[in-house]
Interface confidence: low
């Protein structure tokens, strides 16, 4: 009888992660008697995948009933494939021996390639907030994909960015790969509602790329502009002075009124109005009893925004004559007062 041959008809098999790989193997003869074993890799460091004779291999099932003596089909199925399963698999016929079975003939091998989807891109921004006109870096990371070829793009509000650097690791062969990209973004005052998007395209995604996003609201700090105005007389000896704090983000803001340099009142912006661009406006007022002052009063609205050094705006209040309206409230539709004091 012709000597047994081990035939692995498939040089390569491509499987998507999570699916089942079928590795085909047939023998041309029923002799010699002995078990079939499957290995990944060759040489002394090869990894046993399945042993017909003994062992427990929960991920492996046989295509046919290997308990039957007349069986010559030694194909196996490996379930729940991951990138770590990639490699060349060998179907090896052993001859019964003593004290151990002896390797008799090996198949040519089947290369299992695993197509693994990249993980959802994770975009992270700078640790500290930055102000408009500054350039900030965003990183995008995605892991676990295979094959190595991958395309990464950056967008800001739908517009593709060009200032970025991307690396795919490792450089050599690997069961799976990771991508790391850093993009530079110039902030503008309108970026509170902006998003930076990292888009990853890969053969496993069938034209439907994965996206990771970062909201620039987590990154940007828009410093407020201040306007102090004197309102019409409320009562004979009282003047209402308002401090309009406009176009700031984030909301964390503390306002202090000073009369001639002395702290009069400190308050925290609680309920504010939101502009269409995502920035906030707030208004605080101070009722000044003019009769309590002999000389002119310098009123200062001092604002500490998001833990930054305070900015201030002053207003000189003339107390010599009856106060008249000095300036007007020119707040736009979204910049009305929103000091929700409980009266």
């Amino acid at each position: 009888e012709e000597e047994l041959q081990v035939i692995q008809p498939d040089k390569s098999v491509l499987v998507a992660a999570g699916e089942t790989a079928t590795l085909r193997c047939t023998a041309t003869s029923l002799i010699p008697v002995g078990p079939i074993q499957w290995f990944r890799g060759a040489g002394p460091g090869r990894e046993l995948i399945y042993n017909q004779k003994e062992g427990h291999f929960p991920r492996v099932t046989t295509v046919s009933d290997l308990t039957k003596r007349n069986n010559m089909d030694f194909s196996i199925r490996i379930g729940n494939i991951t990138p770590a399963d990639a490699g060349t698999y060998y179907c090896v016929k052993f001859r019964k021996g003593s004290p151990d079975d002896v390797e008799f003939k090996s198949g040519a091998g089947t290369e299992l390639s695993v197509r693994a989807k990249p993980s959802a891109p994770v975009v992270s921004g700078p640790a500290a907030r930055a102000t408009p006109q500054h350039t900030v870096s965003f990183t995008c990371e995605s892991h676990g994909f295979s094959p190595r070829d991958i395309t990464l793009k950056w967008f800001k509000n739908g517009n593709e960015l060009s200032d970025f650097q991307t690396n795919v690791d490792p450089v050599g062969e690997s069961v799976s790969y990771s991508i790391h990209s850093t993009a530079k973004v110039v902030l503008t005052r309108e970026d509170v509602h902006s998003q930076v998007i990292c888009e990853v395209a890969h053969v496993t995604l069938q034209g439907d790329p994965l996206r990771g996003t970062a909201n620039l609201s987590e990154t940007i700090r828009v410093p407020p502009t201040l306007e102090v105005t004197q309102q019409p007389v409320r009562a004979e000896n009282q003047v209402n002075v308002t401090c309009q704090v406009r176009k700031f983000y984030p909301q964390r803001l503390q306002l202090t009124w000073l009369e001639n340099g002395n702290v009069s009142r400190t308050e925290t912006a609680s309920t504010v109005t939101e502009n269409k661009d995502g920035t906030y406006n707030w208004m605080s007022w101070l009722l000044v009893n003019v009769s309590a002052h002999r000389d002119d009063v310098k009123l200062t609205c001092q604002v500490e925004h998001d833990g930054q050094p305070a900015v201030s705006k002053s207003h000189d209040l003339k107390v010599s004559a009856h106060p008249k309206e000095q300036g007007s409230n020119t707040a736009a539709e979204n910049t009305g007062s929103n000091e929700r004091n409980i009266y």
């Epitope: 309920t271 109005t273 939101e274 539709e333 979204n334 009305g336 007062s337 929103n338 000091e339 929700r340």
Partner: antibody, heavy 118, light 107 residues
């Protein structure tokens, strides 16, 4: 469709407790301030409570210390826990979304009736 | 608390009429004023916010105006479905407060 559905109303004795629920659907619940407003039969509207997106809460003096408001964003649900109930708390209670840029009310539930009586 | 006073408390008008309801705040509310319509047995419906902005789906026959402490709701041409009770509300400061309502009845 944006919808608010209140439940949990009923008859309770003075001094008793009741918990109202409001199930929200059709919008990103966690992004909105949510309010409770009540209306006694034949009377006007009275604002009862608000809970902001950050969990901050406010109450008028009439219910302060007796009512608590809470939200469970994962379940798109708003709650009003009413303790030490009085006859004056008898009303239809509405769940309302503060839906505009300035927290103006835009969506109202159908209301649930609370009767406090011995 | 900020008091909201509506006038008149009730109003009789005919279909096709133009009607105006006024609302006065006890102090400035920075234009955080809303108007609501309520029909018997129903939940209120939001009509107007920040004095003059129409809520989505509200017909343009409703209009709001005013500033400071005095505000008005105008219905340009009354239709049968417009007969209801109307409330103003300030939402400038907590506690938010409503006017006592204006009942609009068919003459």
């Amino acid at each position: 469709e944006v919808q608010l559905v209140e439940s949990g109303g009923g008859l309770v004795q003075p001094g008793g407790s009741l918990r109202l629920s409001c199930a929200a659907s059709g919008f990103t619940f966690s992004s909105y301030d949510m309010h409770w407003v009540r209306q006694a039969t034949g009377k006007g509207l009275e604002w009862v409570s608000v809970i902001g997106t950050a969990g901050d809460t406010y109450f008028p003096g009439s219910v302060k210390g007796r009512f608590t408001i809470s939200r469970e964003n994962a379940k798109n649900s708003l709650y009003l826990q009413m303790n030490s109930l009085r006859a004056g708390d008898t009303a239809v209670y509405y769940c309302v979304r503060g839906g505009n840029w300035d927290d103006a009310f835009d969506i109202w539930g159908q209301g649930t009736m609370v009767t406090v009586s011995s | 608390d900020i008091q909201m006073t509506q006038s008149p408390s009730s109003l009789s008008a005919s279909v096709g009429d133009r009607v105006t309801i006024t609302c006065r705040a006890s102090q400035g509310i920075n234009n955080y004023l809303a108007w609501f319509q309520q029909k018997p047995g129903k939940a209120p419906k939001s009509l107007i916010y920040t004095v003059s902005r129409l809520q989505s789906g509200v017909p343009s026959k409703f209009s709001g105006s005013g500033s400071g402490t005095d505000f008005t709701l105008t219905i340009s041409s009354l239709q049968p479905e417009d007969f209801a009770t109307y409330y103003c509300q300030q939402y400038n400061s907590y506690p938010y407060t409503f006017g006592q309502g204006t009942k609009l009845e068919i003459k």
